[in-house]
């Protein structure tokens, strides 16, 4: 796979993953509760990082934010923070990678600068993906360990039904957002790794840039302004007729330097 293709694919995969991380963070179905068949209407409860929702069998849905809750655990706050950090790093990674893409020309940016930017964006995507995966995994662990609530009956006043309080739903299950988050985090991570691999291909190899000089014995060889390519017929590709003149370079000529083949 060419460097450009690897870099471009890595960027696209990371972009898809990043979009998934945003979607997961905003989704309400991080945890769902077993359908509760109330005699009046079937009720389906589900909860996200920011609000809790209830959907009735009629289709009516009501969501309420957690700002009225008295006790938000530190672990939920940590999951929120991890997802937000993942999004922020993803945004920075996307901005950096856009400038780092080999197929995009910005000023006189050389390959070494693009390589560094590609590596930076790759690392940002990797960290972003890891943040999302850890965040979702921590939430899933909270569900598994903490959310199996035993039915509690608390009686007050007279016996029988009077003043009774009991839990309605006792079981929490994984919501769709968890799976979206895991997949999205994985994609972002894979995209970041691909960007890092592409960086290696972009890094200039020192052996390509050493000046070459040939000494012909017994005769003076005149300097050719056109360089080796012009004098020998090499590089007569009609697509790339511009010889280095200090201006813009085409993609195929981007490793040409004024000192590369100036002496024959």
């Amino acid at each position: 796979m060419s460097v450009t293709a690897c870099q471009g694919l890595g960027f696209v995969v990371s972009l898809i993953g990043f979009a998934g991380i945003i979607a997961a963070t905003c989704m309400d179905q991080w945890s769902t509760q077993d359908l509760y068949n109330n005699p009046v209407t079937a009720v389906f409860n589900y909860q996200g990082l920011w609000r809790s929702c209830v959907r009735e069998s009629s289709g009516f849905t009501e969501c309420r934010g957690y700002f009225t809750l008295l006790g938000l655990p530190a672990m939920l706050q940590a999951v929120r923070a991890l997802m937000i950090v993942g999004i922020v790093l993803g945004v920075i990674g996307i901005l950096v990678s856009i400038f780092a893409l080999k197929c995009i020309r910005i000023g006189s940016m050389d390959d070494s600068a693009k390589a560094k930017m590609t590596l930076t964006s790759g690392i940002l995507f990797i960290i972003s993906g890891i943040c999302a995966i850890i965040g979702v995994s921590v939430f899933a662990n909270m569900l598994v360990t903490n959310f199996w609530m035993s039915t509690a009956n608390m009686y007050s006043g007279m016996g029988g039904m009077g003043g009774m309080v009991q839990t309605v739903q006792t079981r929490y299950t994984f919501g769709a957002a968890l799976f979206v988050g895991w997949v999205a985090g994985g994609l972002t991570l894979i995209g970041g790794v691909m960007m890092c691999i592409a960086c290696r291909g972009l890094t200039p190899d020192d052996s390509n840039f050493k000046a070459v000089s040939y000494h012909a014995s017994g005769q003076n060889v005149a300097y050719r302004p056109g360089g080796f390519k012009a004098s020998t017929g090499f590089g007569s590709n009609t697509r790339n007729k511009k010889i280095y003149d200090g201006g813009a370079r085409t993609e195929d000529d981007e490793q040409s330097h004024p000192t590369k083949y100036d002496y024959v």
């Epitope: 009046v40 409860n45 209830v54 009735e56 008295l70």
Partner: nanobody, 123 residues
Amino acid sequence: EVQVVESGGGLVQPGGSLRLSCAASGSIFSINVMGWYRQAPGKQRELVAGISTGGTTRYADSAKGRFTISRDNAKNTVYLQMNSLKPEDTAVYYCNADLATATSWPVRYLEVWGQGTLVTVSA
């Protein structure tokens, strides 16, 4: 601590009317369904009428056409307007609320019952 308190019960003549009120209080995050159940002496508890947040209502066959349930979501209160009362409507009427408490996360959904209010229909 969350609780529901009923009021409005009492003695009424056949054909008369009564309006029962039930207010939920405490650390309430949201209420899904509020309803009225009744239990006559020696009989099992039965649903009289219920109403969901979305406005879905359900009535027992014996209550249809005579009883009307309504709800004030802002006040966490449910009302049961009972008309054309019959002696067989005599029972202890219990308020029931399926609600979420605001004391913890994840949101815990509880089924809360009131102490009950006695409705007696007698000449």
